[in-house]
Interface confidence: low
């Protein structure tokens, strides 16, 4: 269980000529609100497929009225986070759709009218519990800046919020509503308690007692805008109540990605996701065909079926992107069981197992037999997270504590009679047969089917099975 959180920092006209002056139509004032939709996986899903991971609506933003001849400002936004709770595991890979809706407040018959102003789709990988990820997206003539994160709630921990933890003070048994109980961690990996007063909206902490600020904010409690000048012009709302919501200049400012590429900020740099037909650091290389070898990492290039895509790259396992330029984070699928650490070595996945577990995916529990004695000389056999006893002759049951009748299975062949013996069983063979189970016929000339009868035993003597 957990919650996905989205913070819209700014929505306004994008850079460049031809940007709209106002989101409102000529009919009068309007206000904005946002709809966020989460879909699982990274596939190009149809726009109308459902928000299977969840969805949420923002509140309405303040009413905006265009001022004639005034410079186009960023638009007043709704306050607060958009939160999308999720009940099951956080999938790690997901599609994020953010829709900006305009509510026109003019004199329409029947009340307000709504129209979709911009729609941004972003396919991302995101581990729960990580820091805020920041993004800037262009949608037509509009530009949207936002941050998002996924965090676990209740007693869930881990990058997928699938492990349940138990606070140190809690009893060892599962409380009501905790399903499934296993595997319970020894203690909760609760998020650290930040410095008292640290802004919930603009600050975060990775160690107890600290207060680290999101870009654009400063001060010991992250309550002071880093630069009031960043609240001016085209880059975000400024008000006495909300302060400046906009981060300072970032690598994606001005959108360095050409040809419709979308920019994502990475630590100290940026990354362009290019549309088909373009590649390069800034999506600046165009007019590409298969002859140019645009598919990286061994991707197979085939000519595109339509003029807009001169080629298509079929990527080998472990790579993705329109040019197979991105390595798939195969560890995000959490293949290592029982808390094992996943290592993506490129050519293979490796799981580093916790003590007591083994196997390629840490699936074998080595402690199955620990502290479980098998009685009466039985030996413990491991497997599948449970122990099994292989019992000595004459004993059976889960722990070899039950006496078993060795003759119950009628082990003596050809009419031989079975006698229980302290070390097993003895077969008294019918005339004409010999062997420990009376399995060998004695030939008419007195020679058995065996190479020789054991010394001291005549054909027909009772054979003791040792």
């Amino acid at each position: 269980a957990g919650v996905f959180e989205l913070q819209i920092h700014s929505f306004g006209p994008g850079p460049g000529p031809g940007a709209p002056r106002s989101p409102c139509s000529a009919r009068g004032p309007c206000r904005l609100f946002f709809r966020v939709c989460l879909k699982p996986g990274l596939s190009e899903e149809a726009a109308e497929s459902p928000c299977a991971l969840g969805a949420a609506l923002s509140a309405r933003g303040p009413v905006y009225t265009e001022q004639p001849e005034a410079p186009a400002p960023d638009l007043p936004l709704p306050n607060g986070l958009l939160q999308v709770p999720f009940r099951d595991a956080w999938p790690g890979t997901f599609s994020l759709i953010i829709e900006t809706w305009r509510e026109e407040l003019g004199d329409q018959i029947g009340g307000p009218a709504w129209s979709l102003l911009a729609r941004v789709t972003r396919r991302r990988r995101l581990a729960a519990g990580g820091p805020w990820a920041r993004d800037i997206q262009r949608a037509g003539a509009w530009e949207l800046r936002f941050s998002y994160r996924a965090r676990c709630e209740l007693l869930a921990v881990g990058t997928a919020c699938t492990r349940l933890c138990r606070p140190r003070s809690a009893p060892s048994r599962c409380g009501p509503g905790l399903r499934p109980c296993a595997p319970l961690e020894d203690e909760c990996e609760a998020p650290p308690v930040c410095r008292a007063g640290c802004s919930l909206e603009h600050g975060f902490c990775e160690q107890p007692g600290e207060c680290r600020c999101l870009e654009g904010w400063t001060g010991p409690l992250c309550t002071v805008p880093a630069s009031t000048s960043s609240c001016l012009g085209l880059r975000g709302p400024s008000s006495a109540t909300t302060g400046c919501l906009v981060p300072g200049p970032g690598p994606c400012d001005g959108n360095p990605c050409a040809n419709g590429g979308s920019c994502s900020e990475t630590p100290g740099s940026f990354e362009c996701t290019c549309p088909r037909g373009f590649y390069g650091l800034r999506c600046e290389v165009s007019g590409v065909t298969c002859a140019d070898g645009p598919c990286f990492n061994g991707g197979l290039c085939v000519g595109g079926a339509d003029p807009d895509s001169a080629y298509i790259c079929h990527c080998p396992p472990g790579f993705q992107g329109s040019n197979c330029e991105k390595r798939v984070d195969r560890c995000s699928l959490q293949p290592c069981r029982n808390g094992g650490l996943c290592l993506d070595l490129g050519h293979a996945l490796r799981c580093r197992c916790r003590a007591g577990f083994a196997g390629p995916r840490c699936e074998h529990n080595l402690d199955d037999c620990a502290g479980r004695a098998c009685a009466n000389g039985g030996t413990c056999v491991e497997g599948g997270g449970a122990h099994r006893c292989s019992c000595a002759l004459g004993f059976g049951g889960r722990d070899c504590r039950e006496r078993a009748d060795p003759c119950a299975a009628r082990p003596c062949a050809h009419g031989g009679r079975c006698y229980a013996h302290f070390s097993g069983l003895v077969c008294a063979c019918a005339p004409g047969y010999m062997g420990s189970r009376c399995e060998f016929p004695v030939h008419p000339d007195g020679v058995s089917a065996l190479p020789a009868a054991p010394p001291g035993l005549r054909p027909g003597d009772p054979q003791r099975y040792l």
Partner: nanobody
Framework: EVQLAESGGGLVQAGGSLRLSCTAS????????MGWFRQAPGKEREGISC????????YTADSVKGRFTISRDNAKNTLYLQMNSLKPEDTAMYYC???????????????????WGQGTQVTVSS
Amino acid sequence: EVQLAESGGGLVQAGGSLRLSCTASGFTIAVYTMGWFRQAPGKEREGISCTSWAGGRTYTADSVKGRFTISRDNAKNTLYLQMNSLKPEDTAMYYCAAKAHPDCSGDWSPSGYEYWGQGTQVTVSS
């Protein structure tokens, strides 16, 4: 998998009441405009009531106004239609539907709706 499942239909005498439910799975109705439609044998499917996700406004067709009430419980992911003072002409198969657009369209067209249930039969005897 996306599913809308209607329930609550049945046989009722004229003047009686029924409450239809429509439970969604695979998506969240909170951000969908939800509507009730009905289709009588030999007739086209008609919209009878709708609740928008923008503003939560509700609309009801004139033919059932004052008798039918639409409501939703987002926490339970369920849409309801309370039907009172039922008439024989209300006999039809009743369907619930969902669409992503924030408002109910004025023409009650079913074409904009993306997800449909299988329907529940309502029969009103005289």
